[in-house]
C-alpha cells in the first residue's frame, strides 16, 4: 500500500469549542437550503477502496477542493459563519500541505473526482450541498488525520 507522510493534524485543531460550533452552524444553515437529501458527497462511497492510512490524504484533497471551488466562490453567503470558518479550514489545509502519498494514488483521485463531478453536475446546489456537509468534512478530517 502507498505510504503517506506528514498526514497528521494535532487533536487540538478539533477541540476548539468556538470554531467547532461555528463550523457546525454553517453546515446546518447551508443544509437548510439543500433540498437534494438523497445525494451524499462525504460518506461510504468516498472512502470505498481507500485504506485507513490513506484517508487523511484523501480528505486533504477534498478539503482543498471545497476551499478553492466551493467556499471561496460562495464566501459572501452564510455570514457571519463563513468569514470565520473559511480561515480555520484554510489553516488545516496549510498544515496538510506536506501530506503526500508515495506510490500510486489513482484510486484516491478517482473517488475524489467522483465527488467533484457530483458537485459540478449539481451546479450551485452542489456547492450548497458541499457547505452543508462541512460537519462531515470536519469529522472526516478529525477521524482520518489525528
Amino acid at each position: 500500500a502507498p505510504i503517506s507522510s506528514h498526514c497528521r493534524l494535532d487533536k487540538s485543531n478539533f477541540q476548539q469549542p468556538y470554531i467547532t460550533n461555528r463550523t457546525f452552524m454553517l453546515a446546518k444553515e447551508a443544509s437548510l437550503a439543500d433540498n437534494n437529501t438523497d445525494v451524499r458527497l462525504i460518506g461510504e462511497k468516498l472512502f470505498h477502496g481507500v485504506s485507513m492510512s490513506e484517508r487523511c490524504y484523501l480528505m486533504k484533497q477534498v478539503l482543498n477542493f471545497t476551499l478553492e471551488e466551493v467556499l471561496f466562490p460562495q464566501s459572501d453567503r452564510f455570514q457571519p459563519y463563513m468569514q470565520e470558518v473559511v480561515p480555520f479550514l484554510a489553516r488545516l489545509s496549510n498544515r496538510l500541505s506536506t501530506c503526500h502519498i508515495e506510490g500510486d494514488d489513482l484510486h484516491i483521485q478517482r473517488n475524489v473526482q467522483k465527488l467533484k463531478d457530483t458537485v459540478k453536475k449539481l451546479g450551485e446546489s452542489g456547492e450548497i450541498k458541499a457547505i452543508g456537509e462541512l460537519d462531515l468534512l470536519f469529522m472526516s478530517l478529525r477521524n482520518a488525520c489525528i
Epitope: 438523497d38 445525494v39 451524499r40 460518506g43 461510504e44 462511497k45 460537519d135 462531515l136 469529522m139
Partner: antibody, heavy 119, light 107 residues
Framework: QVQLVESGAEVKKPGASVKVSCKAS????????ISWVRQAPGQGLEWMGW????????NYAQKFQGRVTMTTDTSTSTAYMELRGLRSDDTAVYYC????????????WGQGTLVTVSS | DIQMTQSPSTLSASIGDRVTITCRAS???YHWLAWYQQKPGKAPKL??????SLASGAPSRFSGSGFGTDFTLTISSLQPDDFATYYC?????????IGGGTKLEIK
C-alpha cells in the same frame, strides 16, 4: 413511496438460527445502508449493527459480534439479518431501518418482525 | 462505547403543556444526535436529526437543541397524539447507541 417491508413472525427453539429479511422499495437501494435494531418485550431499542448496500461492509455492536451476520442482495433490494445460537432473551421485535452510515439517522423503518425463542 | 442517558424515564403531563426531555452522552458527540417517537406496537419514527433539524413530516411543535454532551427534546404544546415513548440516539460513523427511553404519559 419509500418503504421497508420485513418478513413474517418466527418461532424458534433455543440454539437455532433465524434469518429476517427486509425488502426496500421507492429509493436507490445502494445509496443507503441498513441498520438492525431490536426491542425485547416491554424494553427499549437496542442497535445491533449496520450493513452497507453499496459494498456489503458491516459493523456490528460488540454484544452481537460472532453471532450475527448482516448481508444485502442488490438484485432484489433486500437486506438480511441472521442471528445464531438463539436464547430466550433474544425474543424481541427486530426492525430494519434505512441508514447511510457516516452519521446518518434512521429515517425509514420496517414494520418489525417478532422472533420468539421458546423450547 | 458511548453511553446515552435519558431523563426522566417516565414523565406525566397534560394537553397543552410544554415538555422537555433530556439526553446526555458519555462523551462529546458534536451534533450527531437523533430523536425518535414510538407508540405501542409500532415502529419508531424519526423526529429530529443532527440535534436540532426537524425530520420530514414531523410536527413543528417538536424541537431539539444541544451540542457536545447535553441535548434536549422539547414539545411546545402537548397534543393527544404525542403520548408515546421517546428515544435519543447517538449517530456514529458506522454505529449507533440508543438511550433508555422516556415514556410520556397523560397526567
Amino acid at each position: 413511496q419509500v418503504q421497508l417491508v420485513e418478513s413474517g413472525a418466527e418461532v424458534k427453539k433455543p440454539g437455532a438460527s433465524v434469518k429476517v429479511s427486509c425488502k426496500a422499495s421507492g429509493y436507490t437501494f445502494t445509496s443507503y445502508g441498513i441498520s438492525w435494531v431490536r426491542q425485547a418485550p416491554g424494553q427499549g431499542l437496542e442497535w445491533m449493527g449496520w450493513v452497507s448496500a453499496y459494498t456489503g461492509n458491516t459493523n456490528y455492536a460488540q454484544k452481537f459480534q460472532g453471532r450475527v451476520t448482516m448481508t444485502t442482495d442488490t438484485s432484489t433490494s433486500t437486506a438480511y439479518m441472521e442471528l445464531r445460537g438463539l436464547r430466550s432473551d433474544d425474543t424481541a421485535v427486530y426492525y430494519c431501518a434505512r441508514d447511510r452510515g457516516y452519521y446518518d439517522a434512521f429515517d425509514i423503518w420496517g414494520q418489525g418482525t417478532l422472533v420468539t425463542v421458546s423450547s | 462505547d458511548i453511553q446515552m442517558t435519558q431523563s426522566p424515564s417516565t414523565l406525566s403531563a397534560s394537553i397543552g403543556d410544554r415538555v422537555t426531555i433530556t439526553c446526555r452522552a458519555s462523551e462529546g458527540i458534536y451534533h450527531w444526535l437523533a430523536w425518535y417517537q414510538q407508540k405501542p406496537g409500532k415502529a419508531p419514527k424519526l423526529l429530529i436529526y443532527k440535534a436540532s433539524s426537524l425530520a420530514s413530516g414531523a410536527p413543528s411543535r417538536f424541537s431539539g437543541s444541544g451540542f457536545g454532551t447535553d441535548f434536549t427534546l422539547t414539545i411546545s404544546s402537548l397534543q393527544p397524539d404525542d403520548f408515546a415513548t421517546y428515544y435519543c440516539q447517538q449517530m456514529g460513523e458506522y454505529n449507533a447507541t440508543i438511550g433508555g427511553g422516556t415514556k410520556l404519559e397523560i397526567k
